[in-house]
């Protein structure tokens, strides 16, 4: 079996953490949010072939259904494993305060 | 903001749960399960549009990011939100066992 | 560690109807390909099929008693239960309940005698 | 109905010796056929799946055989625990329905 984190493809074409820089305006919370201005979003981004990082058994099995059935079913995709926490300064009716987002920047990556 | 759970690309084109049916062999377990012999194999298949079945912040960032950097990075992807265990008799060296799988079939569905 | 246990009333008179309850642990009748299926075995004799559920809720029954049978399950509970209306004599016997994977009766519990008697 | 037929309600051996249980399917039912032990006093206990797999933990001189009607379970090597009633069973269609057993006496 291939190793799960070698990308057949070329290096940095399978699915993988990639950072995006942000302003608060790309985001759409320029009007709930007062800082960070800009944020470095890191998201999973990149391909899924055969054996990479597959996240479970549904994913073996999304991907065998895929090569028989292309047209029905499609590959796994490239989605967050876990999570970082991340704080935002949030307008208030009053001013502000603090809230903590458990579900916000992707930590690492694998496909399901 | 538009019903979570209102498709507006029509009725069934939008993330939810569909269900293929396959045999030992399309899902490449021939060489190790003895049953069951065919499985009704539930998965998450669907466009993830704007505010539809949206899983965290994170795929609302997503979905923003997306409509301003179209070719960097992708639409929310669809995916299982939970699963539902099955039971496998697989084959071992010396006969059968008993085996449940808690990652096998997705129970229900959202974008990330 | 799969156990089951059938519990009944043990002694009951012809024409009533018997109840029996199988409580199960180790496994969930809500995991795909699961079952529990009933079994009685009159003294010294051989094993008969009555019904079985499965975790979708499909029930099947033996075709001879089918009008007599009734199985559900509490899948939160961890619970199946037979009915069996209208008993007779040759309804005594030892009543077992197992645990059901795709047609196999992998577990089963002690069993329960039932006594049927005037 | 299938019928599942077990010819010989006792058999008798020795400790050490071989013995072959059979059971015949009045049709067809592939591969679909399961063993059970139930030692005296006790419940049932799972042996063989599929004809010819022996479920985890059962000693290897216990093997099953047979597809279509004809079904063998041999006990090679018999020991004194295997004093036991013998059943087969087809999950092949609805009733599922078992032999009538054949009972193991040890001399």
């Known amino acids: 079996a291939r190793n799960g984190d070698r990308c057949p493809l070329g290096p940095g074409r399978c699915c993988r953490l990639h950072t995006v820089h942000a302003s608060l305006e790309d985001l759409g919370w320029a009007d709930w949010v007062l800082s960070p201005r800009e944020v470095q979003v890191t998201m999973c981004i990149g391909a899924c072939p055969s054996q990479f990082r597959e996240a479970n058994m549904h994913a073996q099995i999304k991907m065998n259904l895929h090569r028989l059935k292309p047209d029905t079913v499609p590959a796994p995709c490239c989605v967050p494993a876990s999570y970082n926490p991340m704080v935002l300064i949030q307008k208030t009716d009053t001013g502000v305060s603090l809230q903590t987002y458990d579900d916000l920047l992707a930590k690492d990556c694998h496909c399901v | 903001a538009r019903n979570g759970d209102r498709c507006p690309l029509g009725p069934g084109r939008c993330c939810r749960l569909h269900t293929v049916h396959a045999s030992l062999e399309d899902l490449g377990w021939a060489d190790w399960v003895l049953s069951p012999r065919e499985v009704q194999v539930t998965m998450c298949i669907g466009a993830c549009p704007s505010q539809f079945r949206e899983a965290n912040m994170h795929a609302q960032i997503k979905m923003n990011l997306h409509r301003l950097k179209p070719d960097t990075v992708p639409a929310p992807c669809c995916v299982p939100a939970s699963y539902n265990p099955m039971v496998l008799i697989q084959k071992t060296d010396t006969g059968v066992s008993l085996q449940t799988y808690d990652d096998l079939l997705a129970k229900d569905c959202h974008c990330v | 560690q799969v156990t089951l246990k059938e519990s009944g009333p043990g002694i009951l008179q012809p024409s009533q109807t018997l109840s029996l309850t199988c409580s199960f642990s180790g496994f969930s009748l809500s995991t795909y390909g699961m079952g529990v299926g009933w079994i009685r075995q009159p003294s010294g004799k051989g094993l008969e099929w009555l019904a079985n559920i499965w975790w979708n809720d499909d029930k099947y029954y033996n075709s001879a008693l089918k009008s007599r049978l009734t199985i559900s399950k509490d899948t939160s509970n961890n619970q199946v239960f037979l009915k069996i209306s209208s008993v007779d004599t040759a309804d005594t016997a030892t009543y077992y309940c197992a645990q059901e994977v795709y047609g196999w009766f992998a577990y089963w519990g002690q069993g329960t005698l039932v006594t049927v008697s005037s | 109905d299938i019928v599942m037929t077990q010819s010989q309600k006792f058999m008798s051996t020795s400790v050490g010796d071989r013995v072959s249980v059979t059971c015949k399917a009045s049709?067809?039912?592939?591969?679909?056929v399961a063993w059970y032990q139930q030692k005296p006093g006790q419940s049932p206990k799972a042996l063989i799946y599929?004809?010819?797999y022996r479920y985890s933990g059962v000693p290897d001189r216990f093997t099953g055989s047979g597809s279509g009607t004809d079904f063998t379970l041999t006990i090679s090597n018999v020991q004194s625990e295997d004093l036991a009633e013998y059943f087969c069973q087809q999950y092949n269609s609805y009733p599922l329905t078992f032999g009538g057993g054949t009972k193991l006496e040890i001399k």
């Open positions: 599929s004809a010819s």
């Open positions: 049709q067809n039912v592939g591969t679909n």
